[in-house]
Amino acid sequence: PCKILKCNSEFWSATSSGSHAPASDDVPEFCAALRTYALCTRRTARTCRGDLAYHSAVHGIEDLMSQHNCSKDGPTSQPRVRTLPPAGDSQERSDSPEICHYEKSFHKHSAAPNYTHCGLFGDPHLRTFTDHFQTCKVQGAWPLIDNNYLNVQVTNTPVLPGSAATATSKLTIIFKNFQECVDQKVYQAEMDELPSAFADGSKNGGDKHGANSLKITEKVSGQHVEIQAKYIGTTIVVRQVGRYLTFAVRMPEEVVNAVEDRDSQGLYLCLRGCPLNQQIDFQAFRANAESPRRPAAASPSPVVPETFPYETAVAKCKEKLPVEDLYYQACVFDLLTTGDVNFTLAAYYALEDGKMLHSNKDKLHLFERTRELP
């Protein structure tokens, strides 16, 4: 099978801030990482040459090489292996199974961990770790999570031609190599492809002593996958609802904030939310939608499907989401902008996943939309 995803993930790890352009003093290092990436893709050519992912990588490398004036010849880089803070006591022997169980090791030096929740669903709507709720454009590839333990990158594509409303068509999760617990593992989901295994075919963390502290479970074939990363106290839920993907995570605050470079790495969406210029004011959209004559300019999409009048959208969303919270409002927004009834389910499952993953049940329903960055 084609292993181009391994090249992609190694490049992603080596350039740590992922989709962001390097600062000028990082360019030589970035170019070295690009040359390594190019070498990796060349090695996979025999088994990947017929696949889109391979050609996308090759063209992407060429584009980045020219953008950053990288020479084809020159030094290459090793994927960066960060010194990760231990999950438990620094005195703890690394071959102890406890190091691979976050809660057990956490209790040694603190009270019970505080858990936080982030979710991305629909058009897309983002619930951040700080319980801010935003509707975003974020077309293309964006870092959802980027900390010392894992990277999550989403790719969002327009729901309709020319629309500012996008939805998640691809999701890549990289669990970084961690002590005696797990090897680096990559999970990649795309539209119509929700695997029940990591990219290398495995279902756990590899060959290390604590490999079972990372496990992938298929809940519903092709529709619902759960990944348990016990060594960092993290649960991830990935679903395919209709054509698009949803993401939800439960993660301890300590892990959320485990970033080396707050200025660059801390910019990920689950932590900081979407940049202001990427946010859609769906409250204003809703106000326009409720008025009898709906102006087209109110919509983030130039094509407003006529399949769902406002009343129908409200009825359909009420069916699944009786509480008129922001999940309900997101549902109405999505039906009005896309005409795709599957977005009702996306909002419903996002709320259900929130119920399972959010530590504070009182904060589950959000009623006030916060547009500012936290």
Partner: antibody
Amino acid sequence: EVQLVESGGGLVQPGSSLKLSCVASGFTFSNYGMNWIRQAPKKGLEWIGMIYYDSSEKHYADSVKGRFTISRDNSKNTLYLEMNSLRSEDTAIYYCAKGTTPDYWGQGVMVTVSS
Amino acid sequence: DVVLTQTPVSLSVTLGDQASMSCRSSQSLEYSDGYTFLEWFLQKPGQSPQLLIYEVSNRFSGVPDRFIGSGSGTDFTLKISRVEPEDLGVYYCFQATHDPLTFGSGTKLEIK
């Protein structure tokens, strides 16, 4: 779950033509190269050829070059194998398989070339 | 074209025992920096082939760890550490390093 279903096989006379189809589901068909492989009765496997995800390149085994043509319609999630100037030695089960190098295979379709 | 020669042609083993088969290539299958595109397939009776091992030694999704691939250059081996009833069938090696892609002639595994 990856599924590949071949169809279009049957009994034909030497020198005639036949077009096989392979309908794919359970993965993003338009992202992957695809292969055709065949297996003569009681014999081993023989690679016939492959096509890139966007049809930009096709590669064939010498035994079928100039006679067989691989094509695809990504909008229909379908891979095709057009076989001309068929010979008795083309009698085989024909499999389509996903990937630049095959990982998942269809159940196969029988083609018999006989007078 | 690269010729893959598989030995033995057939192999009869007792359940629970180890089985070992060989695949020899007419030229090196190393492609680049140690990447070698040699795969093993199993074709169970009446079924289509299924991928077991890729890049010499990597088990494909869902393949039990009793299947162990090894080798380099021109000599490759597939071992089954404890043969189970569902392992019977014909094992084919396959190379993707050189065009055209080629299969070995197969090793038939039978249960004693």
